[in-house]
Interface confidence: medium
């Protein structure tokens, strides 16, 4: 025997109190699939969570984060504060990257500069707190007699000294 509830479409629920008739989801609730016996409560985006997509009878609301924060986790389950480029988030807030490390985003951790010598290359542009070093040709390629290489003009000032 077919379950009468299977005929209830998304946006409705199978109301046991009304002889399993399909009733619309009440305000601020939804059902995203058919045959549901209940509707789920809509997510409310408040505080640092902003509404990216309103709740409908067939789909949950979606949140993102207010300016100064970015989403983390499935479905933006957390809002984490942004830092500036050249910084990372620590337990005490945003801190500058240590010398020898960089972060070119508003999130994430400071990462070590590329070690050009590991690839047998030279440093073409020094690293900064915000940018990785740019590796150039290997020292052998720059020896007399080798084809000349004109390095591009650095996009920014050379790396800073240790703090």
């Amino acid at each position: 025997l077919q379950d009468p509830c299977s005929n209830c479409p998304a946006g409705t629920f199978c109301d046991n109190n009304r002889n399993q008739i399909c009733s619309p989801c009440p305000p601020n609730s939804f059902s995203s699939a058919g045959g549901q016996r209940t509707c789920d409560i809509c997510r409310q985006c408040k505080g640092v969570f902003r509404t990216r997509k309103e709740c409908s009878s067939t789909s949950n609301a979606e949140c993102d984060c207010t300016p100064g924060f970015h989403c983390l986790g499935a479905g933006c389950s957390m809002c984490e504060q942004d830092c500036k480029q050249g910084q990372e988030l620590t337990k005490k807030g945003c801190k500058d990257c240590c010398f020898g490390t960089f972060n070119d985003q508003k999130r994430g951790i400071c990462r070590p500069w590329t070690n050009c010598s590991l690839d047998g290359k030279s440093v073409l542009v020094n690293g900064t707190k915000e940018r990785d070093v740019v590796c150039g040709p290997s020292p052998a390629d720059l020896s007399p007699g080798a084809s000349s290489v004109t390095p591009p003009a650095p996009a920014r000032e050379p790396g800073h000294s240790p703090q």
Partner: nanobody
């Protein structure tokens, strides 16, 4: 009854100062990170500043950085917002909020479970 009650709002001239207070009752204030939010007329809710449960970690929106200072006195169950160099664009209803889950600068969804009723700040000459 769990309650947050803001006070200290009012009319102030541009460049002036105000100190908002938020008195907490009915819950263990020292277990909660606290934030200030504001809502300007016709605008959405804007986060202003947060302070961790023990007061060691503070973070501010760029728009108020260097002008506003958030602080708390857990012995008095009170949150404060010292507002200096006020501008017309700071005009808003200011709300305090308590959230149980604030870790490493992150708010977890569903953690904003205690809200005040707000206090109005008007900056005008």
């Amino acid at each position: 009854e769990v309650q947050l009650l803001e006070s200290g709002g009012g009319l102030v001239q541009p460049g002036g100062s105000l100190r908002l207070s938020c008195a907490a009752s009915g819950f263990t204030f020292g277990d909660y990170a606290m934030s200030w939010f504001r809502q300007a007329p016709g605008k959405g809710l804007e986060w202003v500043a947060v302070i961790s449960d023990d007061g060691s970690n503070k973070y501010y929106a760029d728009s108020v950085m260097g002008r506003f200072t958030i602080s708390r006195d857990n012995s008095k169950n009170t949150l404060y917002l010292q507002m200096n160099s006020l501008r017309a664009e700071d005009t808003a209803m200011y709300y305090c909020a308590g959230h149980y889950d604030y870790v490493w600068g992150s708010f977890r969804y569903g953690a904003f479970d205690i809200w005040g009723q707000g206090t109005l700040v008007t900056v005008s000459s």
